[in-house]
């Protein structure tokens, strides 16, 4: 028996662009709380008990109200640890799901409203009694920093909390073959911890830290299959526990990767690339099933009835990602044509069109000159989304209604004098200069 402890250090916007300012607002104050779900990291774990190792809910954190203009801080967190007691042996490898929830404290009818802000999941190897392990996980634009450990509750001790420490005064109950371990003479040592990474399927150990292979397997962690056909030479090295040690055609022969994983050889053994929903050395573990509710934003979870089958989230319009966790930036596809401004309203897209264009995507080019008259003999020129008048000499302005002073722009160079004329302008050039604008 023992307790898994989780300490949340910070929750806030992650690095990089697009990070949210805050889950709360000046109009809608809120506070955070966390939920942790633990599962033993074994592929056969039943799906009907999604948190088979246990679950815990934190207290509510302090109320937070965003200050407009202030930089986005890490959000105030609940006090204390999240503690998940476990009754049996600590499994050593476990899956976790940590959810960050927001409690909105506005004027909701019927009390506060809760919504899931972020969910992170992972699989870790952890010995009970060890130091705190630190971790950083990102969920969308959010970042969660936390530490965790597993500790045994007296009288249990050991990396799995399966050894019982008895008082020295109690008579020894160590069975044959179980040696007492120092410093308590009456403490019985039962389970062996094999070498870290020793294949759970093809390895075994008689001594702590050992990794011996079943016949047909080799390598330091018993992950490499042996081809006995390559041992025809009597001089070929062989062993009682490993069979023939000469490696066969390759460690990926027979594809050791489960659940549709693809195998690639590495210098020392092999590596599995797992399909969505699976992980582990051989893709044998599915950490999250539909029972865990992995689909955000109203996504529909299908498949994944048990940990050996991957789940798939069917996302509602406007969301994407394997867990429907990403809002689709539909404006990034630039659906508004002719320079229209795109507005994503969540439930719909709206285009705000420039003058001279219309339609849901600003696809219609309006006749800019329709119903437009240019005064004083000017002619209408269509284009650029707005009508323009080409005015007769002596007139200007949008509709050629203003009498133009052709000398206002001082068109005569080198000190030439400008005179307005009915047909335009005339430059009287200074001595030594010539040309229509005295430019020579």
């Amino acid at each position: 028996a023992g307790v898994f402890e989780l300490q949340i250090h910070s929750f806030g916007p992650g690095p990089g662009p697009g990070a949210p300012r805050s889950p709360c607002s000046a109009r809608l104050p809120c506070r955070l709380f966390f939920r942790v779900c633990l599962k033993p990291g074994l592929s056969e774990e039943a799906a009907e008990s999604p948190c088979a190792l246990g679950a815990a809910l934190s207290a509510r954190g302090p109320v937070y109200t965003e200050q407009p203009g202030a930089p986005a801080p890490d959000l105030p967190l609940p006090d204390g640890l999240l503690q998940v007691p476990f009754r049996d042996a600590w499994p050593g490898t476990f899956s976790f799901i940590i959810e960050t929830w927001r409690e909105e404290l506005g004027d909701q009818i019927g009390g506060p409203a809760w919504s899931l802000l972020a969910r992170v999941a992972g699989r870790r190897r952890l010995a009970a009694g060890g130091p705190w392990a630190r971790d950083i996980q990102r969920a969308g634009a959010w970042e969660l920093r936390f530490s965790y450990r597993a500790r045994c509750e007296p009288p249990a001790v050991g990396t799995a909390c399966t050894r019982l420490c008895r008082p020295r005064s109690a008579p020894s109950r160590c069975g044959p073959g179980l040696r007492p371990c120092a410093p308590l003479e009456d403490e019985c040592e039962a389970p062996l911890v094999c070498r870290a990474g020793c294949s759970p399927e093809h390895g075994f150990c008689e001594q702590p830290g050992e990794c011996r292979c079943l016949e047909g397997w080799t390598g330091p962690l018993c992950t490499v299959p042996v081809s006995t056909s390559s041992c025809l030479s009597p001089r070929g090295p062989s062993s009682a526990t490993t069979g023939c040690l000469v490696p066969g055609p390759g460690p990926c022969d027979g594809n050791p990767c489960a659940n549709g994983g693809s195998c690639s050889e590495t210098p020392r053994s092999f590596e599995c690339t797992c399909p969505r929903g699976f992980y582990g050395l051989r893709c044998e573990v599915s950490g999250v099933t539909c029972a865990d509710g992995p689909c955000f934003n109203g996504g529909l979870c299908v498949g994944g009835a048990d940990p050996d089958s991957a789940y798939i989230c069917h996302c509602p319009p406007g969301f994407q990602g394997s867990n429907c966790e990403k809002r689709v930036d539909r404006c990034s596809l630039q659906p508004c044509r002719n320079g229209g401004l795109c507005l994503d309203l969540g439930h719909a897209l709206r285009c705000r069109c420039r003058a001279g264009f219309a339609g849901p995507r600003c696809e219609h080019d309006l006749d800019d000159c329709a119903g437009r008259a240019c005064a004083n003999g000017g002619t209408c020129v269509e284009g650029g989304g707005a009508h323009r008048c080409s005015c007769a000499l002596g007139f200007g302005g949008r509709d050629c209604r203003e009498r133009a002073d052709p000398c206002a722009a001082r068109p005569c160079a080198h000190g030439g004098r400008c005179y307005a004329h009915f047909s335009g302008l005339v430059c009287a050039c200074a001595p030594g200069y010539m040309g229509a604008r005295c430019e020579f």
Epitope: E45, D88, P91, P191, C194, P200, F204
Partner: nanobody
């Protein structure tokens, strides 16, 4: 606490049969495998037969294939080893073992002696 208790060992003439039983208790998580190992005097411990508890698939040492059969009774949490056509070289201490993630558990063993 995981406990494995073997029974069914004994002495038999070459060509005879024995059935070993291993009763497992004290755990709630499914093991990776349950199996039978043996160790003859002066030799290394070696696996005889393994049953993968999730899938029910089996693994046999090449020298016992066709003679020994491993099976499990999930309701009783017991694994069996049916040994037929026994040979003198099968003489050894037979141990029941269980693998849970990185942990190995062993029973106390039961002696099998095959005389010619």
């Amino acid at each position: 606490q995981v406990q494995l208790a073997e029974s069914g060992g004994g002495s038999v003439q070459a060509g005879g049969s024995l059935r070993l039983s291993c009763a497992a208790s004290g755990y709630t998580y499914t093991s990776n495998w349950l199996g039978w190992f043996r160790q003859a005097p002066g030799k290394e411990r070696e696996e005889v037969a393994i049953i993968y508890t999730g899938s029910g698939s089996t693994h046999y040492r090449s020298s016992v294939k066709g003679r020994f059969t491993i099976s499990q009774d999930n309701a009783k949490n017991t694994v069996y080893l049916q040994m037929n056509s026994l040979k003198p070289e099968d003489t050894a201490m037979y141990y029941c073992a269980a693998r849970f993630s990185e942990y190995n558990y062993w029973g106390q063993g039961t002696q099998v002696t095959v005389s010619s």
